[in-house]
């Protein structure tokens, strides 16, 4: 009896949908695997007789529930199927946005770039897919624990009237208010303000 794949899960970030599993212990030799998806009542092969422990399902529609399954094989024997269901638009992880930061005196000017949908030629982004897309920004004075959060209305934001000659750190994530779903934070970007622009009287 061939044991089934273990720890079967979907690793999906920005609609790059990778089904992953672990090979079970099997004394007779090396196992291969077949992974399939349900397409209108029929299971279709996606990865056949692969020695890998992952399979790319990124071509599946972003919308609706999908049933995926994988089994282990050895010679003419095979394990039972292990099934999972997956809805990309609900389940994919929203990766960190890009962010450009520029210091102008005592202000930080930030521009946000929504993460791209993976493995597509065009520049479609996660913002295209989710109507309610917005950004959360958090910033703090470097070396302190207190963080401030804002929700910009646009793809840019300006933090004004900051302390001069002080390093501030900023990070951004995507947020979907209608789903109460937050994406991953970008890596912090830290920049030092310069002087304030007030002219002494």
């Amino acid at each position: 009896m061939v044991p089934p794949p273990e720890n079967v899960r979907m690793n999906s970030v920005n609609f790059k949908n990778i089904l992953q599993w672990e090979s079970p212990a099997f004394a007779k030799g090396n196992l291969t695997f077949t992974a399939q998806y349900l397409s209108y009542r029929i299971f279709q092969d996606k990865c056949m007789n692969t020695t890998l422990t992952e399979c790319d399902f990124s071509s599946l529609s972003k919308y609706g529930d999908h049933t995926l399954r994988v089994r282990a094989e050895f010679a003419d024997e095979h394990s039972d199927w292990v099934n999972i269901t997956f809805c990309p638009v609900d389940d994919t992880i929203i990766g960190p946005p890009g962010m450009q930061v520029e210091v102008l005196a005592d202000s930080l000017h930030m521009r946000f770039l929504a993460p791209k949908i993976e493995n597509e030629y065009e520049t479609w982004t996660m913002k295209n897919v989710y109507n309610s897309w917005t950004y959360n920004v958090q910033y703090w004075k470097n070396g302190t624990d207190e963080k401030f959060q804002i929700t910009p209305q646009y793809d840019f934001e300006v933090l004004r009237n900051l302390e001069p000659w002080t390093t501030y750190c900023v990070q951004v994530r995507g947020f979907l208010p209608d789903r109460n779903k937050a994406g991953e934070w970008s890596e912090p970007v830290c920049e030092q303000t310069t002087h304030d622009e007030t002219v002494p009287s």
Partner: nanobody
């Protein structure tokens, strides 16, 4: 909400032609992948022709040289020109769309398209 509405089906003699149309609302054809599928009685739904946002096309072997898929982005309409029709082309024809898709993957199965029309019947008699 994306809605697709097919039209242009009907009955025709073998060797004849039909032009199917698919009008979209809530969706822009230039922003995704589109396809025509068909389903004959007692058979599975199968891909007939697909077109990507860049205009590149794919056809099932059984219709190559006879069918042409095209789209008019300005009218937000997808077309399937069917020539030299055969009795085996008899089926319900469905329009399908997958928004924000460009052709990074070849899409050819039902599960790869998220939105569907109600279908239009094509009957070819010998």
């Amino acid at each position: 909400q994306v809605q697709l509405q097919e039209s242009g089906g009907g009955s025709v003699q073998a060797g004849g032609s039909l032009r199917l149309s698919c009008a979209a609302s809530g969706y822009t054809y230039s922003s995704g992948c589109m396809g025509w599928f068909r389903q004959a009685p007692g058979k599975e739904r199968e891909g007939v022709a697909t077109i990507n946002s860049d205009g590149s096309t794919n056809y099932a072997d059984s219709v190559k040289g006879r069918f042409t898929i095209s789209k008019d982005n300005a009218k937000n309409t997808l077309y399937l020109q069917m020539n030299s029709l055969k009795p085996e082309d008899t089926a319900m024809y469905y329009c399908a769309a997958e928004p924000y898709c460009s052709g990074g993957y070849p899409r050819w199965s039902v599960a790869e398209f998220g939105y569907w029309g109600q279908g239009t019947q094509v009957t070819v008699s010998s």
